[in-house]
């Protein structure tokens, strides 16, 4: 999906006003310096980009973050502020759904989550130079 | 341009009803999503309920579900508040506020729909004031 027509402001909206709260309650009980952001942005499409591959594709040692609360309403914001997001994804989700793991909370998730959070900040800050 | 204008305030006994009003005008009514907001002095400004005009859907704060009910009347370009029960907590300034694609999208609105900042366009404010 090519995010260049989404409402950058409305997902900032969102993000700040729900999504950040429970990525934040997500990682609770972890230091915010335990973790290196490795993964980086240079816009916000390419952010966006970022942000649903982390969020959710399966990685090894991180089954699906995709029925946490922040990753549900990643989801929603995607399909009411990205115009076309939602038929793109009608296909992946009947996938995910044959795939679906009980939620277990590993090093791993947690590692991807503060990533995740990384690259949502970066989004919010878009005139930054790339570091 | 794009107007929204409340109407329906006053002051009421505890345990009344009032009925607000929102007309709108200058943009595709059935497209939009229209949600009432309150603001107490003192207060932040919160989301009291929400509708979608493409199909019906409505979401209420818990602090006001089963008093108030949202309607909408796509052929008036009206979107209607009947509050019942009022309580002395319910004194406040009441906006409406429209936003372009939650109403096309309402099953994915009900995580945002509370949120003022998400929304395009405000109107001026009728005040409710409920007496004990």
């Known amino acids: 999906y090519d995010f260049t027509n989404c409402d950058f402001e409305k997902i900032k909206a969102a993000y700040l006003s729900t999504i950040s709260k429970d990525l934040i309650t997500y990682m609770s009980g972890t230091k915010s310096t335990e973790f290196n952001n490795t993964v980086s942005c240079s816009n916000r499409p390419h952010c966006l980009t970022e942000i649903q591959s982390l969020t959710f594709n399966p990685t090894a040692g991180c089954a699906s973050l995709a029925k946490e609360m922040f990753a549900m309403k990643t989801k929603a914001a995607l399909a009411i502020w990205c115009p076309g997001y939602s038929e793109t994804q009608i296909n992946a989700t009947q996938a995910m759904k044959k795939r679906r793991k009980r939620k277990v909370t590993t090093n791993k998730c947690l590692e991807q989550v503060s990533q995740l959070q990384g690259l949502w900040r970066r989004f919010n800050r878009p005139l930054l130079k790339q570091q | 341009q794009v107007q929204l204008v409340e109407s329906g305030g006053g002051l009421v006994q505890a345990g009344g009803s009032l009925r607000l009003s929102c007309a709108a005008s200058?943009?595709?009514?059935?497209?939009?999503?229209i949600a009432w907001f309150r603001q107490a002095p003192g207060k932040e400004r919160e989301g009291v309920s929400f509708?979608?005009?493409?199909?019906?859907?409505?979401y209420y704060a818990d602090s006001v579900k089963g008093r108030f009910t949202i309607s909408s009347d796509n052929a008036k370009n009206t979107v209607y508040l009947q509050m019942d029960s009022l309580k002395p907590d319910d004194t406040a300034d009441y906006y409406c506020?429209?936003?372009?694609?939650?109403?096309?999208?309402?099953?994915?609105?009900?995580?945002?729909?509370?949120?003022?900042?998400?929304?395009?366009?405000w109107g001026q404010g009728t005040q409710v004031t409920v007496s004990s």
């Open positions: 200058g943009f595709i009514f059935d497209d939009y999503a």
């Open positions: 506020a429209a936003e372009g694609r939650m109403g096309t999208h309402s099953r994915d609105s009900v995580y945002f729909w509370a949120f003022s900042a998400l929304y395009d366009y």
């Open positions: 509708i979608s005009n493409s199909d019906g859907t409505a």
